[in-house]
Interface confidence: low
């Protein structure tokens, strides 16, 4: 576009330019080719020799322009059509400019610090004759000249007549600029064009609100000499939470989100999530739903699974092994990463399940206790004569750390039947003498309970280091025994098993083993021992 610095046609009032001498250029009202009133300057001193008539415009601020265009519209009389003017009449005039920091006022153009610089000698492409004058055929000439680059704040134009019959119909002064624009979500300011012979002007754009460019590389465009933008390089992208709408970035509306500038559009919130605000960069999960830390923002929100279904078990007694299997939960919570975790509790044989405690490290789980993808597990090293509750919990990526202890589990309760339900530390060494040892243990079935009186105990013992095959055996009906005829200062291994008499006796294993060293002969008196 053109930025107009001076347009004489736009003035209805007197232009009031400076003419020296006073009998030279004269300001006259006229009409243009469209019969609109205009102010013109004319001079026609063609019969007198040595003409030197100057006309100086007012001060013209150059604005941001460095290369300025001067467009002149004028008529010029053909000297040959003026009788008696052959020696004195000219068919050209000169145009000058004078750069200044401020208005020179109405002084003589030649004065004022620096000399005027000549732009050009202007000749008419078409001049008019006396005949044309009679027919009102004034032939209008248009000439455009470029000046600059300018460095001062403004300038005056000056026209020198040396004896022509000329009328200045229009003086228009402008520079070309690339208009302020938005391209690729970047705003580019109005930029003055350089001359047609120079390089393009590179201009850095500013990303529009809520957008961003490549770090360290703002979008750029180039302002061409004709005032057109060319060669865009790069663009801005709407920031997270905003999407492109024409030439600006608008906030993602509620229900939509945008996680990064690299995505052009806001996306609808994934399932079971919501964005209540404008400009959301992610969607918040609804109550009871969550995302795992590894889920992307585009993932649907999910919830913990329901309990495994149809938990079944089988118990084999020799060896004592509990096998479990189950079906997947009815509701996976919307996730595919369901795993299973087992919790083993050892409970009193009677009474509420509340009287349970964790099974402890002794019990082994195959293939593992937690993180199972399989829907089956095996428990080893259970004690005979105990009651176990086993819980199988279903977990997924959004189950909390306490979920295994929560409510999304299935459970079974199993009694392992009579046997040796002791840990090693539950067998008490009551007395140790040089030749005898007294042991006692907790009854596997509480006294008075059905079957309690039928329980028998078998104690097997041998010297440590000797073959297990060289053992001795004693039996007792009570949960205590004194073994005699032992060697002093010798380490013995004792094993106990319990069973109701009958076929099941042989099915029970001797479990566990404990070691006791008899006292030396020199030891005086007896020694009571606390539980080891």
């Amino acid at each position: 576009e053109e930025v107009i610095l001076l347009d004489s046609k736009a003035s209805q009032a007197e232009l009031g330019w400076t003419a020296l001498p006073s009998n030279g250029w004269e300001e006259i009202s006229g009409v243009d080719e469209h019969d609109r009133p205009i102010r013109t300057y004319q001079v026609c001193n063609v019969l007198e020799p040595n003409q030197d008539n100057w006309l100086q415009t007012g001060w013209i601020s150059r604005g941001r322009g460095q290369r300025i265009f001067v467009e002149l519209q004028f008529t010029l009389r053909d000297c040959s059509s003026i009788p008696g003017a052959a020696g004195t009449c000219k068919e050209t005039f000169n145009v000058y400019y004078l750069e200044t920091e401020a208005d020179l006022g109405r002084g003589r153009p030649r004065l004022g610090g620096s000399r005027p610089r000549k732009i050009d000698t202007i000749a008419a492409d078409e001049s008019f004759t006396q005949g044309d004058l009679g027919e009102r055929k004034m032939k209008l000439n248009t000439e455009v000249r470029e000046i600059g680059p300018l460095s001062r704040r403004g300038f005056h134009l000056a026209f020198q007549d040396v004896g022509a019959c000329v009328a200045l119909v229009s003086v228009r002064v402008y520079y070309k600029q690339c208009r302020a624009t938005v391209r690729g979500l970047a705003t580019f300011p109005a930029t003055a064009a350089e001359s047609a012979f120079s390089t393009l002007v590179e201009v850095a754009g500013t990303c529009v609100a809520h957008s961003e460019g490549e770090p360290g590389s703002p979008p750029r465009m180039h302002c061409g000499a004709d005032g057109e933008w060319l060669v865009p390089v790069g663009r801005c992208s709407c920031s997270a939470g905003f999407q492109e709408r024409g030439d600006f970035c608008e906030a993602c509306p509620p229900g939509f989100y945008k996680v990064s500038p690299r995505r052009p559009l806001c996306s609808p919130c994934p399932e079971h999530s919501r964005a209540l605000e404008n400009a959301s960069t992610f969607c918040v999960c609804q109550d009871s739903y969550a995302r795992s830390p590894t889920d992307p923002p585009s993932a649907s929100c999910t919830r913990p699974p329901s309990a495994p279904r149809d938990l079944q078990y089988s118990l084999s007694r020799s060896p004592l092994v509990l096998r479990l299997r189950w079906l997947p939960p009815a509701d996976s919570g919307g996730r595919s990463d369901v795993t299973y975790s087992l919790l083993c509790l050892r409970c009193g044989r009677e009474g509420p399940a509340g009287a349970c405690e964790p099974c402890g490290p002794r019990v082994a789980f195959l293939p593992r206790q937690a993180g199972l993808r399989e829907r089956a597990a095996t428990l080893l090293h259970l004690r005979p004569g105990a009651r176990y509750t086993v819980r199988v919990a279903a977990l997924n990526g959004v189950s909390g750390p306490a979920a295994a202890a929560g409510t999304t589990y299935a459970q079974v309760t199993v009694s392992t039947g009579p046997g040796a339900p002791w840990e090693e530390d539950e067998i008490r060494r009551d007395r140790v003498e040089p030749q005898s040892v007294s042991l006692s243990w907790r009854e596997p079935i509480p006294a008075g309970a059905p079957g309690a009186n039928d329980t028998e105990y078998e104690i097997r013992y041998y010297e440590k280091g000797q073959s297990e095959q060289t053992y001795s055996m004693v039996k007792t009906g009570a949960p205590t025994v004194t073994v005699t005829n032992l060697k002093p200062a010798t380490r013995y291994v004792f094993q106990i098993r319990a069973a109701s008499p009958g076929p099941s006796w042989e099915a029970q294993s001797f479990n566990p083993s404990i070691e006791v060293q008899t006292l030396g002969e020199a030891a005086s008196g007896s020694r009571d021992q606390s539980p080891a």
Epitope: G184, L185, L230, V231, P232, V233, R235, Q243, E244, R245, G246, D247, E250, P253, F256, P264, L265, C266, P268
Partner: antibody, heavy 121, light 107 residues
Amino acid sequence: EVKLEESGGGLVQPGGSMKLSCVASGFTFSYYWMNWVRQSPEKGLEWVAEIRLKSNNYATHYAESVKGRFTISRDDSKSSVYLQMNNLRAEDSGIYYCTFYYGSSAWFAYWGQGTLVTVSA
Amino acid sequence: DIQMTQSPASLSASVGETVTITCRASENIYSYLAWYQQKQGKSPQLLVYNVKTLTEGVPSRFSGSGSGTQFSLKIDSLQPEDFGSYYCQHHYVTPPTFGAGTKLELK
């Protein structure tokens, strides 16, 4: 999920008329310049028409080959864009896709499944 | 209107090979060029815009280059899912125009 669903295609005789519709979902329809692009074995992919936003006074642009015969319109309340095709010619045959620009960047990130228009006697 | 000339019209290649498709504009379109992939019976899918920006989800074996009037799309280490037709399109001024397409077939 962004979805564009065209309908209204079929067989029509030369000189006849037909109106295609496209229903959009999954994005703020009123913010985007909507377009029709067609594809035929003879001419390949060919942009047909564009309609801009309410703020642009619903300005329209057409390919030279359809100017004066086709009219694109939109109904933001229904998230729909239409193509009224009059004085149809054999060379107008093809699959017509509904698609849209991001802002004024004229690349087409989302396309409908297309609707087949056959102009034949 | 700006004419887009694509070459070759068809191309046979094997899985694992690298191929290049070129596109020439009849006048300067700077960096306003997009590439699309189309499988038989499906709609075109945007692969690349602004010459080299990959659309989200497009594998990095695709790369675009060029500026002004000469552009190319390179596919490294072809995968079975890469076979189909490819089209270039300028997005510089209205009307946007497309190339005639390149059909990439399995050798």
